[in-house]
């Protein structure tokens, strides 16, 4: 053995293995990654843990382990096992964890696993299993966790699962399952987590999930579903549902009516065109709802009873109006993204007191009333670009003390109210051709970035000094997560991921040079100095 000192080597430690005593004077034996082709023969009866993973073991003789009545965990992962005979695990009365992943099993052993009464966790993933014998799991009354992912199953082994009434988590992901039959999991009333992602599932029996009364997490991501999985309606405890990356084209009315506990629904990367207006009603735990490009949606969804929603993204649809009482339904909303719709008029959003980010770019909005954004004390970012806004009420932005980013680019503005905007760090007004007046820089003591319709308007902001990567800075804080919006922003924005690091450092260096001067574009530049621009302005 290779334990600390020569005197400390416990008796019954196979050569080259690493052994130590656990707190109960039982032996933990690590024989992993030693190039073994067979099981060590002189194992102590008092072994509680045996790791034989990452070796070259191709056979498990029926009698070698039967004396290890204290063995609780047996690791045989990453070997060359193609078959496990009946009796291989006989006598392992204390066995709780059995790891057989990354071997070459073509079927679950027919009898070797039966009646391991203490077994709680069984890993059979990453083999070549295409067949699960009907009675292979019989007698596994304590089994809680079963891994069968990354195998070659074409069907759910319905009969084999009938004896696993204590099972709490199971993964059948990364197989070749094409259909789930009615009552496929009918006896798994304790199952909490079921992973079916990365299969070839194209159809679900209407009652395929019946019996899963404890299920909280269901993952159907990366399959070939053409229709919404209506079979979820009996899953009254479901909290997390994933069916992203399928081929689902519509979400029906009252789609989640049987799932009032849903907290998270992932359904992106589906060609969803239509969503029933009542689909997301009465989901009191739902925090985030994101739907992009559902071009057949014309009406804002009914969200009665979904009052804890914090982030709502409904982009690329044909929504032309919002309900007047939208904020009565959504008092906890922090992020509202309705970009790329057909909104013309906006109701008052003042009831959405927690709003931090609003994105309404690419709509048909023509006017911002005084009441629209009143008293949104937490609002930090407001994007109204690419609309038809010609009129903004003088006090439209007067009660937005946290606002630091305002984008009004590509509208029809001829004037711009500055009341209440003294905290802005970013302002975009480019593309408003009728906006010709100079905006006094004194109104924006915190401003870092500004984009104006014309170069001469930058002169008020010391515009000749810097050329700057403005668009990069503008978007730096636009992470969609609500948590990102909580982070305090001192003009230098959070690095979202490692790819941004280089840009961030360059910008940081530029900031240090510029100190607190405003970066304004389009910059007058050396060939159009401010003096020249002011001259032509005065002549004009």
């Amino acid at each position: 053995g290779s334990s600390p000192g020569p005197d400390a080597i416990p008796r019954g430690c196979p050569s080259h293995c690493h052994c130590e005593l656990d707190g109960r004077m039982l032996l933990r034996v690590d024989c992993s990654d030693l190039g073994l082709s067979e099981l060590p023969s002189n194992l102590s009866v008092f072994t509680s843990y045996l790791d034989l993973s990452m070796n070259n073991i191709s056979q498990l003789p029926a009698s070698l382990l039967h004396r290890l009545c204290f063995l609780e965990e047996l690791r045989l992962a990453g070997n060359a096992l193609t078959h496990i005979p009946k009796g291989a695990f006989t006598g392992l009365h204390s066995l709780k964890v059995l790891m057989l992943q990354n071997n070459q099993l073509r079927q679950v052993p027919e009898e070797a696993l039966q009646n391991l009464r203490s077994l709680q966790s069984l890993r059979l993933d990453a083999n070549h299993i295409s067949y699960v014998p009907p009675s292979c799991f019989s007698g596994l009354h304590s089994l809680r966790h079963l891994w069968l992912d990354d195998n070659a199953l074409t069907d759910v082994p319905v009969q084999a699962f009938r004896s696993l009434s204590a099972l709490q988590a199971m993964t059948l992901a990364l197989n070749k399952i094409h259909h789930i039959a009615d009552y496929a999991f009918g006896n798994l009333s304790s199952l909490v987590v079921l992973h079916l992602h990365n299969n070839r599932i194209h159809s679900l029996g209407k009652k395929c999930f019946d019996g899963l009364h404890s299920l909280e997490t269901l993952d159907l991501n990366y399959n070939n579903l053409d229709e919404f999985p209506t079979a979820i309606k009996t899953l009254s405890n479901l909290k997390e549902l994933g069916f992203h990356s399928n081929n689902i084209r519509s979400i029906p009315e009252r789609a989640f009516v049987g799932n009032p506990s849903l907290i998270t629904i992932h359904f992106y990367d589906n060609p969803i065109q239509f969503v029933g207006v009542s689909a997301f009603q009465h989901l009191p735990e739902l925090r985030t709802l994101t739907l992009n490009g559902a071009s057949h949606i014309t009406e804002f969804p009914h969200l009665t009873g979904t009052a804890t929603l914090e982030s709502l993204t409904l982009t690329g649809a044909k929504i032309s109006s919002l309900p007047q009482a939208v904020c009565d339904q959504l008092p906890n909303l922090q992020v509202l993204d309705l970009s790329y719709n057909l909104l013309e008029d906006l109701p008052s959003l003042s009831g959405c007191q927690k709003l931090q980010k609003i994105d309404l770019r690419h709509n048909e909005i023509y006017e911002i009333k005084g009441s629209t954004f009143q008293q949104l004390f937490n609002l930090r970012s407001l994007n109204l670009a690419w609309n038809k806004i010609a009129i903004i009420h003088p006090n439209a932005f007067s009660t937005l003390p946290s606002l630091i980013k305002l984008d009004l680019s590509s509208n029809l503005l001829s004037s711009f109210p500055v009341t209440g905007l003294h905290g802005l760090t970013h302002l975009k007004l480019t593309g408003n051709r009728a906006l010709q007046s100079l905006i006094p820089s004194a109104n924006f003591p915190e401003l870092k970035i500004i984009e104006m319709p014309s170069a001469y308007q930058c002169c008020a902001f010391g515009g000749c000094e810097n050329v700057y990567k403005i668009s990069n800075q503008w978007n730096k804080d636009d992470g969609n997560s609500v948590d990102d919006l909580h982070k305090k922003d001192a003009g230098l924005f959070q690095v979202q991921d490692e790819r941004d690091l280089e840009d961030f450092l360059l910008d940081f260096e530029e900031d240090l040079k510029a100190l607190h001067s405003v970066q304004c574009s389009p910059s007058p530049g050396p060939f159009k100095p401010c003096e020249h621009l002011f001259g032509s302005w005065l002549i004009r």
């Epitope: 009918g186 209407k206 019996g211 009516v257 049987g258």
Partner: antibody, heavy 118, light 111 residues
Framework: QVQLQQSGTELMKPGASVKISCKAT????????IEWIKQRPGHGLEWIGE????????DYNEKFKVKATFSSDTSSNTVYIQLNSLTYEDSAVYYC???????????WGQGTTLKVSS | NIVLTQSPASLAVSLGQRATISCRAS??????????MHWYQQKPGQPPKLLIY???NLESGVPARFSGSGSRTDFTLTIDPVEADDAATYYC?????????FGSGTKVEIK
């Protein structure tokens, strides 16, 4: 414990409609299908159809599609069957039952007797 | 529709003896290894009571003298030994396919 309580005996005239109720207690109402079964002396048991309470999911035996309509009210945990254009052949005992283990009917209401006579 | 034919129509059994009831389906009711056949007991003036589900699984609370067997199209309900309380009509039912159907019933009398 699980119980299904049905409404009482109904005496109706031909051509009329009747609505029979089935109130469920003791389990998560919306998680199990409710089945409706008709029993006439000498005709055995006939499956009318099923409803998943609270949802729009229903299934009808083709034979009863015109005759029966199911509905549910989750606020009172009650399922209903409406039978219309009543004839003498509709006289029977109507049972609601819960679709339990693998769709077997594990709990039954006590039955509602419908008598159609002029 | 799947037709379930029960036999015999009636059966008289002595106390302590074995009663065997047969149910034959017009087509297989097996799916992925499960046989979607169930057995019920009905006494006069009462609703049916579930005894056996999926051909051979005893419903909780049902005495072990009841047992079920069979697959595909041929199924059997056995009561062994019969007790006085077992006098009733017994029905098989399939839910493999809509519309779900019942057998015509077997009336068991105790001699």
């Amino acid at each position: 414990q699980v119980q299904l309580q049905q409404s009482g005996t109904e005496l109706m005239k031909p051509g009329a409609s009747v609505k029979i109720s089935c109130k469920a207690t003791g389990y998560t109402f919306s998680a199990y299908w409710i089945e409706w079964i008709k029993q006439r002396p000498g005709h055995g048991l006939e499956w009318i159809g099923e409803i998943l309470p609270g949802s729009d999911s229903t299934d009808y035996n083709e034979k009863f599609k015109v005759k029966a309509t199911f509905s549910s009210d989750t606020s009172s945990n009650t399922v209903y069957i409406q039978l219309n254009s009543l004839t003498y052949e509709d006289s029977a005992v109507y049972y609601c039952a819960r679709g339990g283990h693998y769709g077997s009917l594990d709990y039954w209401g006590q039955g509602t007797t419908l008598k159609v006579s002029s | 529709n799947i037709v379930l034919t029960q036999s015999p129509a009636s059966l008289a059994v002595s106390l302590g003896q074995r009663a065997t009831i047969s149910c034959r389906a017009s087509e297989s009711v097996d799916n992925y290894g499960n046989s979607f056949m169930h057995w019920y007991q009905q006494k006069p003036g009462q609703p049916p009571k579930l005894l056996i589900y999926l051909a051979s699984n005893l419903e909780s609370g049902v005495p072990a003298r009841f047992s079920g067997s069979g697959s595909r199209t041929d199924f059997t309900l056995t009561i062994d030994p019969v007790e006085a309380d077992d006098a009733a009509t017994y029905y098989c039912q399939q839910n493999y396919e809509d519309p779900f159907t019942f057998g015509s019933g077997t009336k068991v009398e105790i001699k």
